[in-house]
């Protein structure tokens, strides 16, 4: 697994460097998670042909993965810092069950999958400190999550491979949109 942000050799070599601001720390954290997703996608794509699957086949999957929409205030038109931050945190909380599903889906990248999951938890904490309106953030229901996890794990092999691919792809896109918006804040 890659070294968590703030622990690479560059940081050790420059002990007198200014500490990271909260925005820089969040930026670095998201890039770290994106690196992890890249590694996981590599294993997924090497193992199956899901990455070449047509969009039609992907669309048939009824996963309810978080996605940025215009109303979320994270795009330039209608950009709203607080609404967007709430959407990012809510979306990340909703992704947690899917990241849990990924935990037993990798052979050579088991550690990497764990790192992505744990780093996402840390990212959520960073973002919650930044948010003013924590009341607007809805936490997913644990019972609903548990039954969703059971349902996903009961799928046949092909659907499990497809689900893994979709989760990684959607999570990557969600993080990219989130970081682009956070860079405006």
């Amino acid at each position: 697994a890659p070294v968590p942000p703030g622990e690479d050799s560059k940081d050790v070599a420059a002990p007198h460097r200014q500490p990271l601001t909260s925005s820089e720390r969040i930026d670095k954290q998201i890039r770290y998670i994106l690196d992890g997703i890249s590694a996981l996608r590599k294993e997924t794509c090497n193992k199956s042909n899901m990455c070449e699957s047509s969009k039609e086949a992907l669309a048939e999957n009824n996963l309810n993965l978080p996605k940025m929409a215009e109303k979320d205030g994270c795009f330039q038109s209608g950009f709203n810092e607080e609404t967007c931050l709430v959407k990012i945190i809510t979306g990340l909380l909703e992704f947690e069950v899917y990241l849990e599903y990924l935990q037993n889906r990798f052979e050579s990248s088991e550690e990497q999958a764990r790192a992505v999951q744990m780093s996402t938890k840390v990212l959520i904490q960073f973002l919650q400190k930044k948010a003013k309106n924590l009341d607007a953030i809805t936490t997913p229901d644990p019972t609903t999550n548990a039954s969703l996890l059971t349902k996903l794990q009961a799928q046949n092999q092909w659907l499990q491979d497809m689900t893994t691919h979709l989760i990684l792809r959607s999570f990557k896109e969600f993080l990219q949109s989130s970081l682009r918006a956070l860079r405006q804040m």
């Epitope: 890039r31 994106l34 940025m68 795009f75 330039q76 990557k172 990219q176 949109s177 970081l179 682009r180 860079r183 405006q184």
Partner: nanobody, 124 residues
Framework: QVQLQESGGGLVQAGGSLRLSCTVS????????MGWFRQAPGKEREFVAD????????WYADSVKGRFTISRDNAKNVMYLQMNSLKPEDTAVYYC?????????????????WGQGTQVTVSS
């Protein structure tokens, strides 16, 4: 990293149009976020616009909003900047940039590959 090459710059009268192209070498073009920056004589390089991998997240600097349009063709490995209603203050060297994380943003530090630039001169 990828190689970037801008083209399409030139001399144009105020109110005219130009289309800049940025050709990218490398198979991973479609995963990159791409941006346009510009640098006027004696000024800092500034953000113009950026576009994500599938063109559904586009940002513009306030100074060009409504006049410039950024787009990309992933099949051809090219990004474009359509510039309409050009003003003398748009005179600058225009650079294209690529972000391998697929994010982009308004600061130079967010991009890891840069082109050499193409000159755009708008005369009054």
């Amino acid at each position: 990293q990828v190689q970037l090459q801008e083209s399409g710059g030139g001399l144009v009268q105020a109110g005219g149009s130009l289309r800049l192209s940025c050709t990218v070498s490398g198979r991973t073009f479609s995963t990159y976020a791409m941006g346009w920056f510009r640098q006027a004589p004696g000024k800092e390089r500034e953000f113009v616009a950026d576009i994500n991998w599938n063109s559904d997240n586009i940002w513009y600097a306030d100074s060009v909003k409504g006049r410039f349009t950024i787009s990309r063709d992933n099949a051809k490995n090219v990004m474009y900047l359509q510039m309409n209603s050009l003003k003398p203050e748009d005179t600058a060297v225009y650079y294209c940039a690529a972000d391998s994380y697929g994010v982009g943003g308004g600061k130079e530090e967010y991009y890891d590959s840069w082109g050499q630039g193409t000159q755009v001169t708008v005369s009054s």
